[in-house]
């Protein structure tokens, strides 16, 4: 808390300018009018204030707006945003995408801070859903943003927003998140033709069910190994050797290098060895010829 002291004669600030960098902390407190600061916030960013001086400016704004800053001030906070706590930000009502962009720009190149996370949360909750423009903006600043959301939060993403998602935005998503995003992507891209559809849906296939993988295997898609390895194990297991061969096309040759890893490892164990032998890849561990295969999941369903 800065002690209240009278402003020395002739030092009263008429505007926010470079002369203020020579003011001591107590002089800033005494000589800068909070209302003037609020109207000229856009100038603060261009002036090389020290962190201690920025603390004083923040304190003045806090006193002026105890219920939270108006958006006209928030939009021009610039580096002062880095001084805000999540508690400060929870008082804000940010509705403009331009404001959001301006503040994200301040934090650009850094990890997502608690302040930024709170800001985004406030913004998205205010909008009611993650629309395409917001998603575009957030993933541009934080490619991992989408995968930082819970499945529940992802359920508020409308299918139309999926068009803004780039493959790298899904790199860190886990299967539970892809389970939510895949049906939305399927809906978003449903009117595209075969090859174009596959290019768009490919990144989301970690959430695809068996039936959709079987359908894709009939379309000469030549899925690459990186995509295949991210498929749900339970979705891959029921696929036949012929279906996997059609699904992967020339990439089927990569199965040998991946025989130790899921889902390939578990899939091999479910196939007949003589079917695996038809691939000519030396994949071992299938069900020996002459053995009867019992589908226990089917048996459980019947009992």
């Amino acid at each position: 808390e800065v002690e209240k002291t009278a402003c020395p004669s002739g030092k009263k600030a008429r505007e926010i300018d470079e002369s203020l960098i020579f003011y001591k902390k107590w002089e800033l407190e005494a000589c800068v009018d909070a209302a003037l600061l609020a109207t000229q916030m856009d100038r603060v960013n261009a002036i090389p204030f020290t962190y201690e001086q920025l603390d004083v400016l923040k304190h003045k704004l806090d006193e002026l707006y105890p219920q939270g800053y108006p958006e006209s001030v928030i939009q021009h906070l610039g580096y002062l945003f880095l001084k805000m706590s999540p508690e400060d930000i929870r008082k804000w009502n940010v509705t403009s995408l331009e404001t959001l962009k301006a503040l994200l720009e301040v934090n650009k190149g850094h990890e997502m801070s608690p302040q930024v996370a709170t800001l985004i949360d406030r913004f998205v909750k205010g909008r009611g859903q993650l629309d395409k423009d917001t998603l575009d903006t957030l993933t541009a600043f934080y490619p991992g943003y989408l995968c930082s959301l819970s499945p529940e939060e992802l359920s508020s993403v409308p299918p139309s927003s999926i068009w803004a998602v780039r493959p790298q935005d899904l790199d860190t998503c886990d299967p539970r998140q892809l389970d939510v995003l895949y049906p939305k992507a399927r809906l978003a891209f449903q009117n595209m033709n075969g090859s174009e559809y596959f290019v768009k849906i490919q990144s989301f296939l970690g959430g695809a069910p068996t039936e959709d993988l079987k359908a894709l295997s009939q379309q000469n898609v030549s899925m690459d190994l990186a995509t295949f390895m991210k498929l749900r194990t339970d979705a891959v297991l029921p696929l036949t050797v012929a279906e996997v061969q059609k699904l992967l096309g020339p990439h089927v040759e990569g199965l040998k290098a991946e025989e130790r890893h899921r889902p390939v490892r578990d899939w091999i164990l479910r196939q007949r060895q003589d079917d695996l032998d038809t691939l000519g890849l030396g994949l071992q561990g299938g069900i020996p010829n002459g053995y009867l295969v019992l589908d226990l999941s089917m048996q459980e369903a019947l009992s």
Partner: antibody, heavy 121, light 107 residues
Framework: EVHLQQSGPELVKPGASVRIPCKAS????????MDWVKQSHGKSLEWIGD????????IYTQKFKGKATLTVDKSSSTAYMELRSLTSEDTAVYYC??????????????WGQGTTLTVSS | DIQMTQSPASLSAYVGETVTITCRAS??????LAWYQQKQGKSPQLLVY???TLADGVPSRFSGSGSGTQYSLKINSLQPEDFGSYYC?????????FGGGTKLEIK
């Protein structure tokens, strides 16, 4: 610590066979494939084949089919390579090497010290 | 089977220099590529796997790059201990061939 221990140098006569052991320690033997590599004096490396110790599944390069046989003894965590009908062309250093256990597993991360085989009458 | 063509076959450079070794595959190997270093009389050592991932303990002056059929290993600011032979190896399909090797000598 992962270690692959191979046997010392072998001197054998043409037409004979030899079995080279590679004893693994410091990791779960059945969790990683074992590859075998040949290096003739002053030459490049030549991949022979690969064995999955868990199920005994093998794969060989065409040149070594009928020449090399890869086996494992799970109880002693040892991989073996048998070379038969030996000729002077088989004189080389033979390495066993463990294959990486990551997705996109393109690499041999631990190597034995090599066994020098000399075929001479 | 996919063949690996490595170049140059030999190379001499000064300590502190930057060198690049390349490997061309006869078909697309989808980044399933490793690089090894071998010193005289020693076993090879893994440097890079998956075309660009540095193996544990490998200095950051080594880097792998490439895709499809063209791959390279770059060594920045060569150190005396970097001299030796370098080999690439692919892991696509079922025959995992090595390149012919590059002998890196000190000038």
């Amino acid at each position: 610590e992962v270690h692959l221990q191979q046997s010392g140098p072998e001197l054998v006569k043409p037409g004979a066979s030899v079995r080279i052991p590679c004893k693994a320690s410091g990791y779960t033997f059945t969790d990683y494939n074992m590859d075998w590599v040949k290096q003739s004096h002053g030459k490049s490396l030549e991949w022979i084949g690969d064995i999955n110790p868990d199920n005994g599944g093998t794969i060989y390069t065409q040149k070594f089919k009928g020449k090399a046989t890869l086996t494992v003894d799970k109880s002693s965590s040892t991989a073996y390579m048998e070379l038969r009908s030996l000729t002077s062309e088989d004189t080389a250093v033979y390495y066993c090497a463990r294959r990486l256990h990551y997705y996109g597993s393109s690499g041999l991360d631990y190597w034995g010290q090599g066994t020098t085989l000399t075929v001479s009458s | 089977d996919i063949q690996m063509t490595q170049s140059p076959a030999s190379l001499s450079a000064y300590v502190g220099e930057t060198v690049t070794i390349t490997c061309r595959a006869s078909g697309n190997i989808h980044n399933y590529l490793a690089w090894y270093q071998q010193k005289q009389g020693k076993s090879p050592q893994l440097l890079v796997y998956n075309a660009k991932t540095l193996a544990d303990g490998v200095p950051s002056r080594f880097s792998g790059s490439g895709s499809g059929t063209q791959y390279s290993l770059k060594i920045n600011s060569l150190q005396p201990e970097d001299f030796g032979s370098y080999y690439c190896q692919h892991f696509w399909s079922t025959v995992w061939t090595f390149g012919g090797g590059t002998k890196l000598e000190i000038k």
